[in-house]
């Protein structure tokens, strides 16, 4: 297949809404449940998500929501928050009207004339906010995740089916399949579709084999494929890296723990703005790279790579992607240089002599099967041929 075309690289930030919402066909999602197919029902009202009113929640709406989310039908109505006939008592006659307050605080309702999402509509201020919220557990409690890839947008593909997390076999696994995964998870588009052993092998069942998505499906389980077969082992677990995944490296220093900060995001390496590159950001990066703590933030060079990233951390985050971040914002970066850092584990701090490497490219063979090219004595980047 041709690879899916990446969307335009707009200015983006961690605070923005997901690129793709699971309930695209119906402005609804389930939260605080065991998976994306169970939980409290929330509906989208313009820019915000609001809990759906429990008083008007019925089996038709539950069925419609589950179907719209690709989660099969709803479980028995007894599993829903039961409607309570005893509503808050009406005010005594002659009391001051509280209609304005009630309406301002009113909760939206998802009202359905049938069990199909096309027959539903969101009605604003349909209920008083009495604390009862619509909940549902769908029959096919399906979910999807990427694991062991250093973030929610990269890793081994796992599906939740019949209460068990399981892998997907890498037979016929390609960018179209990975694209569906990335979009379903709100992780942008697929940068890589990876065969087995790029990530740690999974355990448990293998739920799918011979997956063959067109790339247009909303859910991975909508793609043609076969149930996981016995001849597919965990050494063949499919993986994906999505455009919204961030990974980092330091280049141009004595080793991997010193140099210019670069982030791989949306398919390319980008520099980081030093205008807000403070000790807290440097500390998070050094720790996440396994390079100890930040010792110094040397003066950077002008930006040379295509995109620019800005981070703002409190210093306690595990990785820079957990910090507040913004991408390709020219205002933030226009006066900045490319951030650099020296981490405590760098050998340049320990006065260890660095052997000279000729500037010309060296080719080194390791274990007779892997050829490594050392391109540049500054960055010492290892690239598999």
């Amino acid at each position: 297949h041709p690879s899916p075309a990446p969307p335009d690289q707009l200015n983006t930030s961690s605070a923005e809404s997901e690129l793709w919402e699971p309930g695209e066909r119906l402005p609804v999602r389930l939260t605080n449940g065991s998976s994306s197919c169970s939980g409290t029902v929330e509906v989208r009202l313009e820019a915000s998500w609001e809990p759906a009113c429990g008083a008007l929640w019925d089996s038709r709406a539950a069925e419609a929501v589950c179907r719209a989310l690709g989660c099969g039908g709803a479980e028995a109505a007894s599993q829903l928050a039961p409607p309570t006939p005893e509503l808050p008592p009406p005010p005594a006659a002659g009391n001051t009207s509280v209609a304005a307050n009630a309406t301002l605080a009113g909760a939206p309702a998802l009202l359905c004339s049938g069990a199909e999402w096309r027959l539903c509509e969101v009605v604003e201020h349909a209920c008083r906010s009495d604390g009862r919220r619509a909940r549902v557990t769908c029959a096919e409690n399906r979910a999807l995740r990427l694991v062991d890839g250093g973030g929610a947008c990269a890793g081994r593909v796992e599906m939740l089916e019949h209460g068990e997390w399981g892998s997907v076999c890498d037979d016929t696994w390609d960018l179209e399949d990975a694209h569906v995964v990335c979009r379903q998870l709100g992780c942008g588009w697929a940068v890589q579709a990876l065969p087995g052993l790029h990530f740690t092998p999974g355990r448990g069942p293998i739920h799918r084999d011979q997956v063959n998505c067109s790339g247009a499906e909303a859910y991975l389980w909508d793609c043609p494929g076969l149930p996981g077969q016995h001849y597919c082992g965990h050494k063949e677990d499919a993986g994906a890296v999505c455009s919204e995944h961030q990974s980092w490296r330091l280049t141009g220093g004595a080793d991997r723990c010193e140099g210019q900060v670069e982030v791989h995001f949306r398919g390319v390496w980008n520099t980081v703005c030093d205008s807000e590159w403070y000790p807290s950001e440097a500390k998070v990066l050094c720790q996440s790279l396994g390079c100890g703590t930040a010792v110094e933030r040397p003066k950077g060079l002008p930006h040379s790579l295509s995109g620019r990233m800005y981070y703002s951390c409190n210093g306690e985050e595990l990785t820079l992607s957990n910090c507040s971040w913004r991408f390709n914002n020219s205002n933030l970066c226009s006066q900045s240089l490319a951030a650099r850092v020296l981490c405590s584990a760098s050998r340049s701090l320990h006065n260890l002599s660095t052997p000279e490497v000729p500037a010309s490219v060296q080719t080194v063979t390791i274990e007779s099967s892997v050829t490594v090219k050392i391109e540049n004595k500054e960055s010492r980047e290892l690239m598999l041929l």
Epitope: A55, L56, P83, N95, G106, A109, V123, C127
Partner: nanobody, 123 residues
Framework: QVQLVESGGGLVQPGGSLRLSCSAS????????LGWFRQAPGKEREFVAA????????YYADSVKGRFTISRDNSKNTLYLQMNSLKPEDTAVYYC????????????????WGKGTLVTVSS
């Protein structure tokens, strides 16, 4: 106790129009979401239309969408149902309903029912 009194029912030809009214005794009328249900001979009561406290949100049964319009005038303590392009299958007793906690779309949230007014659509 809210007293709901419907009026405006009667006999009308197919394709014709009627306007139902529902007046309420309660001074806190604006604290209630209001609506209309109907019951045809030999059938169960069914939802027709609902409106929230101040009239900002409305909801209609699929069978009446585009033909019926619900509205309210809080200054007159009155609820209206404008019925256009009437069909024989709209023949029913129409009930005005009031609900404190939610728009009266499902029967379990309804606090008060009127006694009903008969609408007959026939040539």
């Amino acid at each position: 106790q809210v007293q709901l009194v419907e009026s405006g029912g009667g006999l009308v030809q197919p394709g014709g129009s009627l306007r139902l009214s529902c007046s309420a005794s309660e001074r806190t009328f604006s604290d209630y979401a209001l609506g209309w249900f109907r019951q045809a001979p030999g059938k169960e009561r069914e939802f027709v239309a609902a409106i929230n406290w101040v009239g900002g949100s409305t909801y209609y049964a699929d069978s009446v969408k585009g033909r019926f319009t619900i509205s309210r005038d809080n200054s007159k303590n009155t609820l209206y149902l404008q019925m256009n392009s009437l069909k024989p299958e709209d023949t029913a007793v129409y009930y005005c309903v009031a609900s404190w906690g939610a728009m009266p779309v499902l029967t379990h949230v309804i606090n008060y029912w009127g006694k009903g007014t008969l609408v007959t659509v026939s040539s």
